[in-house]
Each structure stands twice: as structure tokens, then as C-alpha cells.
């Protein structure tokens, strides 16, 4: 490429450099531990801590577990990438009555309209099937005069919608107002439209929320409470807890009503890779043999392999790193040659053995 | 220093076939992808295929799908690409890549190469 002779050697002799020949420019050699955001990345800020599988890149560069979706009553939207989480949506037929961050903490069926109304929108995802008179101007046929009220201004009747609670209530009854229960009435009952601004029968006001006791008129003592494994975050929205059902972990603090559940690694592991309110990868406390060092990043893929420490160097223990902190996340498909972390101590002489890193390929 | 030493090029007849292989060596860090590039005479560099080592991952240029295999061997810290039905517009100096995959994406990038190996299809 004698062509590009000026460009390549602007990079030469400068290690945070390289030149991509396939480009055709220089480029940005990111740290050790963070991948590019680019194919050429210009500046530190083209690239970024990779999470482990099933975690994402919050906005505050921490890697935070992804929702699940393995609720019957959900369905995957998108996926969880590497800088956004997985969004579950209700299943079709369904509709969600209570919302929560990336996901639906309660999901009820579509309405099905009665006798005399027909669907003027069809249920979605988010919203319940709207109904209408048959004929416009003419009112569906009275079983009851309570039937024959007119809805107030501007709502449009649906028939009650079905709940699909993902836990304790029964499906047969729904929080209402006051933290009373009613007994589900008959489907061909009308009740107003969800955004009607009184209406007996139907979720709490508050989206997700309903009180943990009835509250005394007049009394502001009503706590606001999410479903079972949903928490009421600081922003007064119901997130999921994290789940600690991978084997590696064990459940530190459970779910609260205000708190997420914590996991933390078992006991004989350690936490490599750090996570909001859990650890995104554990690893075996490192077991030293002589004139060997593990290379903690393989152990929970595949089993142990060692590598001969640098010359003069003595294998190091110390199950923590230097400052204390977590080393940061590497790519989940691992390291090619040399394992970012420990090679963050352990450069290799160019006649020492290195290994290609795969997972069982 | 680093060292992606390539081989195994050499002239064969259209129809036939070559296995190259790409020998790595020295201190690569935070490398997860390797791949094969190519260059005609004349020619820009072409890429040919690539593979992401931890998952396994292969990709392929349509030029060369279902002719070429890419492959690795981590007891020999080796990457190989078998060539099949070989064509004389395959004649090329192939050359060997190792870099990173990009996030949130399914290229590489390209940090270190070697010297290329060539490969000549003629009868």
C-alpha cells in the first residue's frame, strides 16, 4: 500500500494508535477491557465496557441486568443490546394495565364488547379494545337502567377487561379504589373507558400502583405498592428486581417494596464484574499453583487454563484488584490471545505459549 | 511485539484447493475477532471472512460463501481458512487481521496484520 505510506506512518510510534489497512485510516487503539463503538474509533470516547450476556450499558456506564420477559403474559419487543435493555410487551390479546420500566407488571386480556357494541379500536399492547354502539344514535338494549347510563362526556363504554395478574391477587377479583376488591362482574357489564376521570372497577388511579392498606378518608398514609418482584424505585416507578437465578449467585437482600432484591456470588466465588444490585460474573477465588496464574475471565465458560506467569514475575492471588475496584467487563465472547484482565499484569514474552479463547467451539 | 505470521499460499489449478493458516504470537489484548483479507494485483484489499472467537461466529464475503471456511485451533494459536473450487479470480495476497468486535454491531475492528501469503489459481 504505498499509497497510504504518509497515513500509516502518522500512526507509527504511537501506541494508542494503529492503522487499519482494510480502512484505509488511523485509528484509535481502545484501553484493554473496552470495545469500539466504531470499526475506526477516533477518540477514548468511540469506546466503551462491554456488559456481560443478558446486561446492559445504563446511562451511568453501569452494566445493569436486562428485564426478562418469562412471564406467560409477556413477549420480547426488542431484544436487551448491549447499550439498552430488553422491553417485554404483553402477548397479543393482551393488553397492560400497569406499567413498569422496559416491561408490563400486569397484563390484562382484551375486552370483549357486548351485545350491541362494536370494537371502534381494537385492543393493543398498551390499550384496551374501545367499543362503540352498533348504531350510532342508538342505545344497546337495556338489561338494567344502571346499564343504560350514558358514560360521562367524551368516554366511549368497554366491557371490564380480564386480569392476568402475574402473582398473588385472584384472577377472578381487582384492586379498586379504596383498596377494596370487587368480585369481577359479568363481561357484557359496562364500565367507563380507562381515562374516564371516575370509574368503579377498574386499576388503581395510579398506573402500577395500588395502597397496602385501605386509607381512612382523608388520609395521606396510603403507600403506593408494585407487584410481587417489582420494586417502587426513587423515581416513583415499579421496576423489576434483579433475579438471582443464575447458579452462581445467592440472594443477599430480597425484593421490598422500595428496594430491589440484591444477589451477590456464592460462597467460593467472587465477584469479577459488578452489576446494580448483583454481579454480572463470578469467579472461583483464584487457586494459585506454582509458576501458574488462572485466568479468572475463562472459569465460569470452561474449565480452568493456566498460563505460564512472565518471567520473574510471581503469580498473583490477590483475589481483588490493585485499587479495590472491579475489574471492568469484558466481551462475552471472550479474549482472543490473551485475557484483557490478566493481561492487564501479564504481558506475555513473544515466545511464551497464548491461547486462542473460545467457548466450547 | 506483535506477530501474525501467515502461510500455506502457493499456485493451484482452477478446481483446486489450499488450506492458509495464520500463526499468531506476542501480546494481543482484548482481541476477539480474526479474519482474511485479500488483494488482487491491481486491486483494493477485499475482505474475505471473519470469526468471532469467543462465540464462534463465521462470516463470509458473498464471493467466497460456501467455497471457503474460516476455522480456528486454540492449542496452536492458529486461524485457518480453507479455500475449495478455487477460481482464478481468487488470486490474490490474502492477508490475516485480528482486532475487536465493534459493539452493537457484527464488524471488527482490524489492530494487527500480517505480512499476506500468495495464492495463484491458474492452469
Known amino acids: 500500500f504505498p499509497q497510504d505510506r504518509p497515513f500509516e506512518d502518522t500512526c507509527h510510534g504511537n501506541p494508542s494508535h494503529y492503522y487499519d489497512k482494510a480502512v484505509r485510516r488511523c485509528c484509535y487503539r481502545c484501553p484493554m477491557g473496552l470495545f469500539p463503538t466504531q470499526q475506526c474509533p477516533q477518540r477514548p470516547t468511540d469506546c466503551r465496557k462491554q456488559c456481560e450476556p443478558d446486561y446492559y450499558l445504563d446511562e451511568a456506564d453501569r452494566c445493569t441486568a436486562c428485564v426478562t420477559c418469562s412471564r406467560d403474559d409477556l413477549v420480547e419487543k426488542t431484544p436487551c443490546a448491549w447499550n439498552s435493555s430488553r422491553v417485554c410487551e404483553c402477548r397479543p390479546g393482551m393488553f397492560c394495565s400497569t406499567s413498569a420500566v422496559n416491561s408490563c407488571a400486569r397484563c390484562f386480556f382484551h375486552s370483549v364488547c357486548p351485545a350491541g357494541m362494536i370494537v371502534k379500536f381494537p385492543g393493543t399492547a398498551q390499550k384496551n379494545t374501545v367499543c362503540e354502539p352498533a348504531s350510532p344514535g342508538v342505545s344497546p338494549a337495556c338489561a338494567s337502567p344502571e346499564n343504560c347510563k350514558e358514560p360521562s362526556s367524551g368516554t366511549i363504554p368497554q366491557a371490564k377487561p380480564t386480569p392476568v395478574s402475574p402473582a398473588t391477587s385472584s384472577a377472578s377479583t381487582m384492586p379498586v379504589r379504596g383498596g377494596t376488591r370487587l368480585a369481577q362482574e359479568a363481561a357484557s357489564k359496562l364500565t367507563r373507558a380507562p381515562d374516564s376521570p371516575s370509574s368503579v372497577g377498574r386499576p388503581s388511579s395510579d398506573p402500577g400502583l395500588s395502597p397496602t392498606q385501605p386509607c381512612p378518608e382523608g388520609s395521606g398514609d396510603c403507600r403506593k405498592q408494585c407487584e410481587p418482584d417489582y420494586y417502587l424505585d426513587e423515581a416513583g416507578r415499579c421496576t423489576a428486581c434483579v433475579s438471582c437465578s443464575r447458579d452462581d449467585l445467592v440472594e443477599k437482600t430480597p425484593c421490598a417494596w422500595n428496594s430491589s432484591r440484591t444477589c451477590e456470588c456464592r460462597p467460593g466465588m467472587i465477584c469479577a464484574t459488578s452489576a446494580t444490585n448483583s454481579c454480572a460474573r463470578c469467579v472461583p477465588y483464584p487457586i494459585c499453583a506454582a509458576e501458574t496464574v488462572t485466568k479468572p475471565q475463562d472459569m465460569a465458560e470452561k474449565d480452568t487454563t493456566f498460563e505460564a506467569p512472565p518471567l520473574g514475575t510471581q503469580p498473583d492471588c490477590n483475589p481483588t484488584p490493585e485499587n479495590g475496584e472491579a475489574p471492568a467487563s469484558t466481551s462475552p465472547t471472550q479474549s482472543l490471545l490473551v485475557d484483557s484482565q490478566a493481561s492487564k499484569t501479564l504481558p506475555i514474552p513473544t515466545s511464551a505459549p497464548v491461547a486462542l479463547s473460545s467457548t466450547g467451539k | 511485539e506483535v506477530q501474525l505470521v501467515e502461510s500455506g499460499g502457493g499456485l493451484v489449478q482452477p478446481g483446486g484447493s489450499l488450506r492458509l493458516s495464520c500463526a499468531a504470537s506476542?501480546?494481543?489484548?482484548?482481541?476477539?475477532?480474526m479474519g482474511w483479507f485479500r488483494q488482487a494485483p491491481g486491486k483494493g484489499l477485499e475482505w474475505v471472512s471473519r470469526?468471532?472467537?469467543?462465540?464462534?461466529?463465521?462470516y463470509y464475503a458473498d464471493s467466497v460463501k460456501g467455497r471457503f471456511t474460516i476455522s480456528q485451533d486454540n492449542s496452536k494459536n492458529t486461524l485457518y481458512l480453507q479455500m475449495n473450487s478455487l477460481r482464478a479470480e481468487d488470486t490474490a495476497v490474502y492477508y490475516c487481521a485480528a482486532g475487536r468486535v465493534v459493539l452493537g454491531a457484527v464488524v471488527c475492528t482490524n489492530e494487527y496484520w500480517g505480512q499476506g501469503t500468495l495464492v495463484t489459481v491458474s492452469s
Open positions: 506476542g501480546y494481543i489484548y482484548s482481541s476477539n475477532c
Open positions: 470469526i468471532h472467537t469467543g462465540s464462534g461466529s463465521t
